[in-house]
C-alpha cells in the first residue's frame, strides 16, 4: 500500500495535478462496472476495451499524481463531478459512488480519509 503521513499536499498543487491527468479511463472503468454491456451508455465504446485494461490505465493515471490523500480525494471528486450528469437516477448515483470509493484500493492506494464525494451541489 502506498502511504504518506503528515501534510497532505497543497490544494492548488493537487488541482493542477488532477487537471493534468487523464481521468477518462477511470470514468470508463466505473461505468463499465455499473453498466456492463448495457446499450444505453453509448458515450464511450464500452466493448472496445476490457474493464481490467481500463482499470490498469486508470491506476496508471492516478499513479502520476503526488501520493497524498488530498490529491486522491480531489481526483475522485473530479470523476464524480464529470459523470454526475450521466447518472440517470439515485440508484445509479449510489452504485457509481460505491465503485468510486473502491477505486483507490483496486489501484493499491490508501483510500483518502475524510473525502466528501457529495461535491456536485445536490445534482448527484
Amino acid at each position: 500500500m502506498r502511504r504518506e503521513r503528515g501534510r497532505q499536499g497543497d490544494s492548488s498543487s493537487c488541482e493542477r495535478q488532477v487537471d493534468r491527468v487523464n481521468l477518462k479511463p477511470c470514468e470508463q472503468h466505473i461505468m463499465q462496472r455499473i453498466m456492463g454491456e448495457q446499450e444505453q451508455y453509448d458515450s464511450y465504446d464500452i466493448r472496445s476495451t476490457r474493464s481490467s485494461d481500463q482499470q490498469q490505465r486508470c491506476c496508471d493515471e492516478l499513479n502520476e499524481m503526488e501520493n497524498t490523500q488530498r490529491c486522491m480525494c480531489e481526483a475522485l471528486q473530479q470523476i464524480m463531478e464529470n459523470q454526475c450528469d450521466r447518472l440517470q437516477d439515485r440508484q445509479m448515483v449510489q452504485q457509481f459512488k460505491r465503485e468510486l470509493m473502491n477505486l483507490p484500493q483496486q489501484c493499491n492506494f490508501r483510500a483518502p480519509q475524510r473525502c466528501d464525494l457529495d461535491v456536485s451541489g445536490g445534482r448527484c
Epitope: Q8, S11, R70, C73, Q77, A111, R114, D116, D118
Partner: antibody
Framework: EVQLVESGGGLVQPGGSLRLSCAAS????????MTWIRQAPGKGLEWVAN????????DYLDSVRGRFTISRDNAKSSLYLQMNSLRAEDTAVYYC????????????????WGQGTLVTVSS | QSVLTQPPSVSAAPGQKVTISCSGT????????VSWYQQLPGTAPKLLIF???KRPSGIPDRFSGSKSGSSATLGITGLQTGDEADYFC???????????FGGGTKLTVL
C-alpha cells in the same frame, strides 16, 4: 451510557508541565478515534489533537506540536494529553471527546464530550 | 482569527427560522465533511449535525445542515427560547492536517 471524565487540570507556571487524563466508559474505546479540544475563557472551540484507534496515527494543532503528546491505553479505556513547555495562551478548559471518524468517506465529528478540566498557565 | 467564518451573532423571534453560515475554502469545507455543535451557557458542546446533513439520534428535525461548495449552513426552524446558545461549525483541513472550528455564532431568540 457513554461517559468521558477528564482529570489532571490545575494551575501551572509558564514552562511547566501537566498530564491530562480521560477515563472512558459505556462504549468500546478501542474502536474510536479520540480527540482533545480546548476552549479559552470566553473564546471559541479549538481542536488540539487526534489519535487513531490503535494509536498509530496522531495529528496536532500547529501551535502545540512538539510540546503536547496525545496517547491512549486501550486496555484501560483511557486517553492522555502530556503538556510540556506550557504557555499562557494554553490556558483553557480541555475537553476529551469521542470522534466518530470511521472510514475513508466520513468526517471528524465529536459525538460525546467530557465535562472539561481547566488548565491555567500563570506565574 | 478562525479560517472558518461564521457571523458573530444572529437573532430571530420564537417560532421563526434562522440560518447560520460557515464559510471556508477548497482545502477544508470544499473537500471535507462539516459538523455543527450547540453550546449552551456553562455546558460542554453538543453535536447537532455530522457529515454535512446527518442528525444524531435525539436531535430534533428542526435542526438541519447543508453544504454547497466551500460553504455550509445550519438551519433551525420553530425557534425556541431554549435554542439560545453558541453554535460552531467544524471540518478537517487537508492542507493543515487539522480540524478547524468556526469562530462561533451567538443565537438570540428575541
Amino acid at each position: 451510557e457513554v461517559q468521558l471524565v477528564e482529570s489532571g487540570g490545575g494551575l501551572v507556571q509558564p514552562g511547566g508541565s501537566l498530564r491530562l487524563s480521560c477515563a472512558a466508559s459505556g462504549f468500546k474505546f478501542s474502536t474510536f478515534y479520540m480527540t482533545w479540544i480546548r476552549q479559552a475563557p470566553g473564546k471559541g472551540l479549538e481542536w488540539v489533537a487526534n489519535i487513531k484507534q490503535d494509536g498509530s496515527e496522531k495529528d496536532y494543532l500547529d501551535s502545540v506540536r512538539g510540546r503536547f503528546t496525545i496517547s491512549r491505553d486501550n486496555a484501560k479505556s483511557s486517553l492522555y494529553l502530556q503538556m510540556n513547555s506550557l504557555r499562557a495562551e494554553d490556558t483553557a478548559v480541555y475537553y476529551c471527546t469521542r470522534n466518530g471518524l470511521q472510514d475513508s468517506y466520513s468526517g471528524d465529528f465529536f459525538d460525546h464530550w467530557g465535562q472539561g478540566t481547566l488548565v491555567t498557565v500563570s506565574s | 482569527q478562525s479560517v472558518l467564518t461564521q457571523p458573530p451573532s444572529v437573532s430571530a423571534a420564537p417560532g421563526q427560522k434562522v440560518t447560520i453560515s460557515c464559510s471556508g475554502t477548497g482545502s477544508n469545507i470544499g473537500h471535507n465533511y462539516v459538523s455543527w455543535y450547540q453550546q449552551l451557557p456553562g455546558t460542554a458542546p453538543k453535536l447537532l449535525i455530522f457529515d454535512n446533513t446527518k442528525r444524531p439520534s435525539g436531535i430534533p428535525d428542526r435542526f438541519s445542515g447543508s453544504k454547497s461548495g466551500s460553504s455550509a449552513t445550519l438551519g433551525i426552524t420553530g425557534l425556541q427560547t431554549g435554542d439560545e446558545a453558541d453554535y460552531f461549525c467544524a471540518t478537517w483541513d487537508a492542507d493543515l492536517s487539522a480540524v478547524l472550528f468556526g469562530g462561533g455564532t451567538k443565537l438570540t431568540v428575541l
